[in-house]
Interface confidence: medium
C-alpha cells in the first residue's frame, strides 16, 4: 500500500498551529490535520461550532 | 487557473469600495481566496481571504471595515471596503493559494484612487 | 505582526553578475518564507516558498537560504530579464507581511 501523504519536513515543524502537519506526496505541499476545536488551513482559528 | 480584478477605478472619500475577482479554471471552493493590494511607493499588504468552505480571515488593521465574500455560482469572490480614505489608493490584486499562505496564482490588478 | 526588513533597498548590477538580496524578521519564522518577483507593470510571482523550495517552471540560476529571522535570495549569474523588485512574504504568523522590497536594476 502506498501512502498518499509523509510526515513534514523539519521546515514546516510549526506549520500547524494547533494539529498535525502533514505532506501529500502528489500534491507536493503541506495539509494540517486540526486538533478538535480549531478549523483553517493551519489550524489557526478556533472553530466557535465544535 | 485564471483570476481577474474589476473595479471602479476611482472612488470619493467615505465611499464604499466594491471589487470582483472572477475565476476561471478552477473552483473557488477549493483552496483560498484573497486579497492583496500594493500602495504607491511598492509596499504590499495582506489584506484577507476567503477559503473554500466560505470562512474568512481579515488584516486586524482593516478588520472594521472590511468584508470577502462569495457566490460559487458565478465563480467569483467580492471585496468591499468602506469609509475609504485617500490611504486606500492602490493596486489591488486578487490571488489563489491552495494553503493561505503560498499565492501562485494572481490576477492582473485593478487600480484605485480615492480622491475627491 | 512580524516586520520584514529587505536590504539592500535596490541594488544595480551588471548581466552575469551573482547577487544575494536579503530579508530579516523581526522574529522567527521557522522557514516559512517565500520570495516573489514583480517585473514593471506586472504581477507577482512565487520564486521560492519555503525558504529554499524551488517552484516549478522557475529558472534554477534562482535559490533561496536561510532559517530564523534570516533569509537570502541569490540569483545565479542575473539575466536582463530579472530586472524588477523581489519580496519576501512571512506565512509563520497571520497576519501575513511582506517586505518592503528589495528593487534589481540591470545596468
Known amino acids: 500500500v502506498v501512502s498518499h501523504f509523509n510526515d513534514c519536513p523539519d521546515s514546516h515543524t510549526q506549520f500547524c498551529f494547533h494539529g498535525t502537519c502533514r505532506f501529500l506526496v502528489q500534491e507536493d505541499k503541506p495539509a494540517c490535520v486540526c486538533a478538535s476545536g480549531y478549523v483553517g488551513a493551519r489550524c489557526e482559528h478556533a472553530d466557535l461550532l465544535a | 487557473v485564471q483570476l481577474q480584478e474589476s473595479g471602479p477605478g476611482l472612488a470619493k472619500p467615505s465611499q464604499t469600495l466594491s471589487l470582483t475577482c472572477s475565476v476561471t479554471g478552477y473552483s473557488i471552493t477549493s483552496d483560498y481566496w484573497n486579497w492583496i493590494r500594493k500602495f504607491p511607493g511598492n509596499k504590499l499588504e495582506y489584506m484577507g481571504y476567503i477559503s473554500y468552505s466560505g470562512s474568512t480571515y481579515y488584516n486586524p488593521s482593516l478588520k472594521s471595515r472590511i468584508s470577502i465574500t462569495r457566490d460559487t455560482s458565478k465563480n467569483q469572490y467580492y471585496l468591499q471596503l468602506n469609509s475609504v480614505t485617500t490611504e486606500d489608493t492602490a493596486t489591488y490584486y486578487c490571488a489563489r493559494s491552495y494553503d493561505g499562505i503560498c499565492f501562485d496564482n494572481w490576477g492582473q490588478g485593478t487600480t484605485l484612487t480615492v480622491s475627491s | 505582526d512580524i516586520l520584514m526588513t529587505q536590504s539592500p533597498a535596490t541594488l544595480s548590477v551588471t548581466p552575469g553578475e551573482t547577487v544575494s538580496l536579503s530579508c530579516r524578521a523581526s522574529?522567527?519564522?521557522?522557514?516559512?518564507l517565500h520570495w516573489y518577483q514583480q517585473k514593471s507593470h506586472g504581477t507577482p510571482k512565487l520564486l521560492i516558498k519555503?525558504?529554499?523550495a524551488p517552484i516549478s517552471g522557475i529558472p534554477s540560476r534562482f535559490t533561496g537560504s536561510g532559517s530564523g529571522t534570516d533569509y537570502t535570495l541569490s540569483i545565479n549569474s542575473v539575466k536582463p530579464e530579472d530586472e524588477g523588485i523581489y519580496y519576501c512574504l512571512q506565512g509563520y504568523s497571520m497576519p501575513w507581511t511582506f517586505g518592503g522590497g528589495t528593487k534589481l536594476e540591470i545596468k
Open positions: 519555503y525558504a529554499s
Open positions: 522574529q522567527n519564522t521557522y522557514k516559512n
